[in-house]
Amino acid sequence: SSCGQVKCRKGEQCVHTASGPRCFCPSPRDCESGCASSPCQHGGSCHPQRQPPYYSCQCAPPFSGSRCELYTAPPSTPPATCLSQYCADKARDGVCDEACNSHACQWDGGDCSLTMENPWANCSSPLPCWDYINNQCDELCNTVECLFDNFECQGNSKTCKYDKYCADHFKDNHCDQGCNSEECGWDGLDCAADQPENLAEGTLVIVVLMPPEQLLQDARSFLRALGTLLHTNLRIKRDSQGELMVYPYYGEKSAAMKKQRMTRRSLPGEQEQEVAGSKVFLEIDNRQCVQDSDHCFKNTDAAAALLASHAIQGTLSYPLVSVVSESLTPERTQ
């Protein structure tokens, strides 16, 4: 119904009031629910109302506003500290202990986060974004520095329709249009061979507990799995001779693990020769990402941090040990 310039929606009635004509919903059941568009952000609950905008939001602290879009900083709370002596004793031993897997405990001293003690170091959001990996969009964390809110603001739940087929045909130099989508990893760039590469700055250096021959054999699956987490494409970097940069890794000799030496009895020097895994150098190619998304990594720093964040959540499907982002062309060092 309408009266004058006011057009009312389905199920609404027009009521003449002192301040002019207004739309009114006599029975919210019969009207389009204002809640249909999920207007309440940050976990706020939506309640249908009889008058425009036909909803009201009940916000969860620390949010407020008509759509729970406003963040209200709580009175300054002291930063959480890692109180547990247990966690102090267990930090940096190479084993992730969930009781210590918190921001305050530096993710068990990096043991749960691929040795990166603060993946959110560059995140300046007023929200503690590490606590907002919650399957809903938190715009205040939806920045590259805050790791794109774990991609929760752009349909993170989309899955590859023909996943098995697309995995088998990923990066096989044959374009499968059914796999040429973000959720299917853009068919490993098979459909973009004629497009110029768009490399992110830097290199991801990953230690994975798979010997080089096994990793190279499984390279397509490995690159697809990591690319899926980063919502872009990865490739193994080549050295100046054109060789793939995948090297044997002989185990951690850093101070972080001198704390707990390998306990098997071995001849001097023998332990160093045992291949524990691989050190692989990866590049990010955004040629498809930039066409479909504005959430692409311009450099490898935040990409490394996002992988660390996945390690914290326990959602990595490969036995990664560490990840670092190198800005300059690396020398081959072990």
Partner: antibody
């Protein structure tokens, strides 16, 4: 097929020592944590110790700390439990069990060996 | 240390019955809980991890629920091969601890 096979159990006198072995096959031994779990006759399960073969990090139950030592030989894909100063209450079937979550002690044990019986008696 | 308390310690049931076993942790363990089945003379077998995820090859009649301190294992329709002892276990922090077990016997 992922498999764990324990050996080394037997009869030992109180105060004596024994070394149990757990041979792993069918997976990347270095990548996954390993625990020893024991079960006294007619009783429930008790976790004993954990090792992450890659880093060599170890964890122990208070009841065995200082007496038992867990270790791993990554070249042999074998975990060990060296048991010293054995007591009657250590009598149990000892199982080795693989953790499902790579470097996480905070993961379930998804593969178990068949167990080896240790009897401590004079 | 985190204590795990299972109830009941034993129960008698018939084939086709719905069986529920509960497990309570002395402090919050989020969803870091597993359920194991053990038959006499055999090693334990993982049934449920993460409080509610079924392990590979486990029949759909087994389900787990709960979070924090209270957890449940449900067998929707008891089969002859399900008569065994069931253990819950927390893996939130070391020392890893088990419940005392629930023996499911034939009525």
């Amino acid at each position: 097929e992922v498999q764990l096979v324990e050996s080394g159990g037997g009869l030992v006198q109180p105060g004596g020592s024994l070394r149990l072995s757990c041979a792993a096959s069918g997976y990347s031994f270095t990548s996954y944590g390993m625990s020893w779990v024991r079960q006294a006759p007619g009783k429930g399960l008790e976790w004993v110790s954990y090792i992450y073969p890659y880093s060599g990090a170890t964890y122990y139950a208070d009841s065995v700390k200082g007496r038992f030592t867990i270790s791993a030989d990554t070249s042999k894909n074998t975990a060990y439990l060296q048991m010293n100063s054995l007591r009657a209450e250590d009598t149990a079937v000892y199982y080795c069990a693989r953790h499902s979550g790579y470097y996480r002690i905070s993961s379930a044990m998804d593969v178990w060996g068949q167990g080896t019986l240790v009897t401590v008696s004079s | 240390d985190i204590q795990m308390t299972q109830s009941p310690s034993s129960l008698s049931a018939s084939v086709g019955d719905r069986v529920t076993i509960t497990c309570r942790a002395s402090q919050s363990i989020s969803s870091y809980l597993a359920w194991y089945q053990q038959k006499p003379g055999k090693a334990p077998k993982l049934l449920i991890y993460g409080a509610s995820s079924r392990a590979s090859g486990v029949p759909s009649r087994f389900s787990g629920s709960g979070s924090g301190t209270d957890f449940t294992l449900t067998i929707s329709s008891l089969q002859p091969e399900d008569f065994a002892t069931y253990y819950c276990q927390q893996y939130y922090s070391s020392p890893l601890t088990f419940g005392q077990g629930t023996k499911v016997e034939i009525k």
